[in-house]
């Protein structure tokens, strides 16, 4: 009987010879548990595991802690891969995080962090980032040092308010901080002066809600 090959991330999928964009089945580190993820095999050399995508407002991102933990949405469209998988994966080896952004005027930009990992659920999936480069602002729009993850039913931010309720979506809110890629999706011509939209402050300012976002990770030694 042929041994089942399992892949931890899209970099492993790519190196196995699968170089076409699409949905692949990945396996949790040190486990048989599986998860479906979208792999970008073309951008910047390929091998990118997509952990978040916004593009059309078809998926509700105002979700519970558990939903953000296990993931939701459709890997071929808008989705969140899942904090637990990403946490386990990024604690196995060093990963880079690339955040690709599109505005409503046809512009694109990115932020690349040379080291990214999420703490465990016990530490509220706190985000850790180092080494920012890219075109989406010289200052990190994810507050540094990193914050705990917060959702509508898991308030771990620093604000007296509940950032997830004010701004909608789960995110690494500060009080509430310069970004939220999981905010409300606003269509064109309704996307300005929105405090609760899809925000990346150091690229587009405070009230601008973006058209599309993708968060992707890849091993640093790819």
């Amino acid at each position: 009987k042929e041994e089942q090959i399992s892949f931890r991330d899209c970099a492993e999928v790519f190196k196995s010879g699968h170089t076409t964009n699409g949905i692949y089945t990945l396996t949790f580190p040190n486990s048989t548990e599986e998860i479906k993820a979208y792999c970008d095999m073309e951008a910047g050399g390929g091998g990118w595991t997509i952990i978040q995508r916004r593009e059309d407002g078809s998926v509700d991102f105002q979700r519970t802690w558990k939903e953000y933990k296990v993931g939701f949405g459709n890997p071929s469209g808008e989705y969140w891969l899942g904090n637990e998988f990403v946490s386990q994966l990024t604690n196995q080896q060093r990963y880079v995080l690339k955040i690709h952004l599109k505005d409503w005027e046809g512009n694109e930009a990115y932020s690349l962090y040379e080291h990214f990992y999420l703490s465990s659920e016990e530490l509220n999936y706190r985000i850790h980032l180092k080494g920012l480069t890219g075109t989406a602002g010289k200052i990190s729009s994810i507050s540094q040092p990193g914050n705990d993850f917060s959702t509508k039913d898991g308030d771990n931010d620093k604000c007296i308010c509940k950032c997830s309720q004010m701004l909608t979506g789960g995110w690494w809110f500060d009080a509430c901080g310069p970004s939220n890629l999981n905010g409300m999706y606003y269509p064109q011509r309704q996307n300005t002066n929105k405090f609760n939209g899809i925000k990346w402050y150091y690229w587009k300012g405070s009230g601008y809600s973006l058209k599309a976002t993708t968060m992707m990770i890849r091993p640093a030694d790819f």
Partner: antibody
Framework: EVQLVESGGGLVQPGGSLRLSCAAS????????IDWVRQAPGKGLEWVAK????????YYADSVKGRFTISADTSKNTAYLQMNSLRAEDTAVYYC?????????????WGQGTLVTVSS | DIQMTQSPSSLSASVGDRVTITCRAS???????VAWYQQKPGKAPKLLIY???SLYSGVPSRFSGSGSGTDFTLTISSLQPEDFATYYC?????????FGQGTKVEIK
């Protein structure tokens, strides 16, 4: 009509205590947050304390922590500020204010204020 | 604690003048948590602007707010006699809540 009415101010000796009340009408305090803000004679506004009556969370300025206690009785629609170990620097007009915790995320209604004088 | 540094601390202006007051926060603030208040002598403060730029109900349109991040501004486009007062910015996001030190607008 929304109204906040403070009472309980007066002259007190250093080390003494006072309890201020903030009676609300025209709205239910459990749907809002309540703040106490003070203003020393000729000075600016200083936030003192906040309570979220529905959740029971309380927050204090460092200058009053351990001496002042904010509370609320939702059945009486009233908030309180218990002030112990009073000092001369606590002399001020004390205002209670309603804080809307969605939009406007701000203190939209204020009481008329009650004067607290701490002096021997 | 977040410091809210207002400037100027006082200014003299004439009726009809355009007046600008600035407030600088010591760290990044989400815009929805910044408000401006007006206070006249012996009276309680009144809310003018919330969310950094939204005009509160009943406030004349000559008042406007702008800014984001750490720098916020209150503008009175054409000063009226009833606008002579003290103005305060405030952040409501982090405990302790903090006010600016106030800007007194006086008649020239």
């Amino acid at each position: 009509e929304v109204q906040l009415v403070e009472s309980g101010g007066g002259l007190v000796q250093p080390g003494g205590s006072l309890r201020l009340s903030c009676a609300a009408s025209g709205f239910t305090i459990s749907d809002y947050w309540i703040d106490w803000v003070r203003q020393a004679p000729g000075k600016g506004l200083e936030w003192v304390a906040k309570i979220t009556p529905a959740g029971g969370y309380t927050y204090y300025a460092d200058s009053v922590k351990g001496r002042f206690t904010i509370s609320a009785d939702t059945s009486k629609n009233t908030a309180y500020l218990q002030m112990n170990s009073l000092r001369a620097e606590d002399t001020a007009v004390y205002y209670c204010a309603r804080f809307v915790f969605f939009l406007p995320y701000a203190m939209d209604y204020w009481g008329q204020g009650t004067l607290v004088t701490v002096s021997s | 604690d977040i410091q809210m540094t207002q400037s100027p601390s006082s200014l003299s202006a004439s009726v009809g003048d355009r007046v600008t007051i600035t407030c600088r926060a010591s760290q990044f603030l989400s815009s929805f948590g910044v408000a401006w208040y007006q206070q006249k002598p012996g009276k309680a403060p009144k809310l003018l602007i919330y969310g950094a730029s939204s005009l509160y109900s009943g406030v004349p349109s000559r008042f406007s707010g702008s800014g984001s991040g750490t720098d916020f501004t209150l503008t009175i486009s054409s000063l009226q006699p009833e606008d002579f007062a003290t103005y305060y910015c405030q952040q409501g996001l982090l405990s302790p809540l903090t006010f600016g030190q106030g800007t007194k607008v006086e008649i020239k």
